[in-house]
């Protein structure tokens, strides 16, 4: 369960890939597309919003009675709009929608390498947002592995 | 009750290695970063080095990288600070904690241990 | 490397008194900005974490603030076990740094 309803701190950040292209955000068609593309030096990147918030394992889960704090985030490209994963398609999709916000648009956020995080589905444990072929794609990752995969790296660059 | 426990602090000479330890207990240890975050006498806290829950790729203040090796034990409960090339500089109370949150590094460190005391002296 | 400057080095203040440390860093940190209170021969305790969340535990005479550079701590109302060393942390990015700690000592 989240731990209120209100995010511990937001702030507004660049998203880009590991291979430093950068995720941008087009109206078309009264509706919003996500491209992850290499940008033109003068063109300024595209800001998100990113809301933080705690979120408790049960302890069920910890295995020995002890909660474990998650830390969970949205990400709001623009106004009343978030990111929201679609398990079905696999796909990542920005969806206008009122808070409260359902649990597809909440990520785990998971700290990697110096400067990269990963975001990982609230609603599917194991699987990330990732990049394939130039688009946001939820990408399923065996825990087995490296999670440090680099298709679902992301910087954040304030 | 979230116990971190630390051991193997003692007087070594200038030169020499020493290998610290750190039970913890009352947690899922493998899903936590730890840290080991140190305090020369009468002085303020300093970080030396950080690793994650998976035991993933660690990190290193500038003054002990390449002599200082943080590990862990993951199905013993231990975290590791190897200390190699000792000096004078080093002697201090060393702490080791353990993170906030789960996945993330950003919240800080919760629970800290009571820390062993290292003397490097000849 | 971020560096952490904090002041006052150390106040004099009384049992009652607001006190207010304050926190600078050298390049943005966003919030995450953590407090520590160290008392002699004790390990710190965590006491804000994310520039102004409270720790579990932390009475709530505590406060933080801030984000990006700067960042403060409040003891709204000095209790006796409020005299300690405070210390804030960024966690940013590496490597992480603390800054030097600001003694409170009895008036």
């Known amino acids: 369960s989240i731990t209120g309803i209100s995010p511990i701190t937001e702030s507004l950040a660049s998203l880009s890939t590991y291979n430093d292209q950068s995720i941008t955000f087009a109206l078309e068609d009264e509706s919003y597309e996500i491209y992850v593309e290499d940008l033109k030096k003068d063109k300024k990147k595209d800001k998100v919003l990113l809301s933080y918030y705690e979120s408790q394992h049960p302890s069920s889960e910890s295995g020995d009675g002890v909660d474990g704090k998650m830390l969970m985030v949205t990400l709001s490209p623009t106004k009343d709009f978030w990111l929201q994963a679609n398990n079905k398609e696999h796909s990542v999709e920005l969806h206008k929608c009122e808070k409260p916000l359902p649990d597809q648009a909440f990520f785990v956020l998971h700290n990697r390498s110096f400067n990269c995080v990963s975001f990982e589905c609230k609603t599917d444990p194991g699987v990330f947002i990732g990049v394939k072929d130039n688009h946001l794609a939820l990408i399923k990752v065996d825990y087995s592995e490296n999670l440090g995969s680099e298709n679902i790296l992301f910087k954040l660059s304030e | 009750e979230v116990q971190l426990v630390e051991s193997g602090g003692g007087l070594v000479q200038p030169g020499g290695s020493l290998r610290l330890s750190c039970a913890a207990s009352g947690f899922t240890f493998s899903s936590y970063a730890l840290t080991w975050v140190r305090q020369a006498p009468g002085k303020g806290l300093e970080w030396v080095s950080f690793?994650?829950?998976?035991?993933?790729?660690?990190f290193y203040a500038d003054s002990v990288k390449g002599r200082f090796t943080i590990s862990r034990d993951n199905s013993k409960n231990m975290l590791y600070l190897q200390m190699n090339s000792l000096r004078a500089e080093d002697t201090a109370i060393y702490y080791c904690?353990?993170?906030?949150?789960?996945?993330?590094?950003?919240?800080?460190?919760?629970?800290w241990g009571q820390g062993t005391l290292v003397t490097v002296s000849s | 490397d971020i560096q952490m400057t904090q002041s006052p080095s150390s106040v004099s203040a009384s049992v009652g008194d607001r006190v207010t440390i304050t926190c600078r860093a050298s390049?943005?940190?966003v919030s995450w900005l953590a407090w520590y209170q160290q008392k002699p021969g004790k390990a710190p305790k965590l006491l804000i974490y994310a520039a102004s969340s409270l720790q579990s535990g932390v009475p709530s005479r505590f406060s933080g603030s801030g984000s990006g550079t700067d960042f403060t701590l409040t003891i709204s109302s000095l209790q006796p076990e409020d005299f300690a060393t405070y210390y804030c942390q960024q966690s940013n990015s590496f490597p992480f740094t603390l800054g030097p700690g600001t003694k409170v000592d009895i008036k």
């Open positions: 904690a353990k993170s906030l949150y789960t996945t993330s590094w950003y919240g800080g460190f919760d629970s």
């Open positions: 690793i994650s829950g998976s035991g993933g790729r660690p």
């Open positions: 390049q943005g940190v």
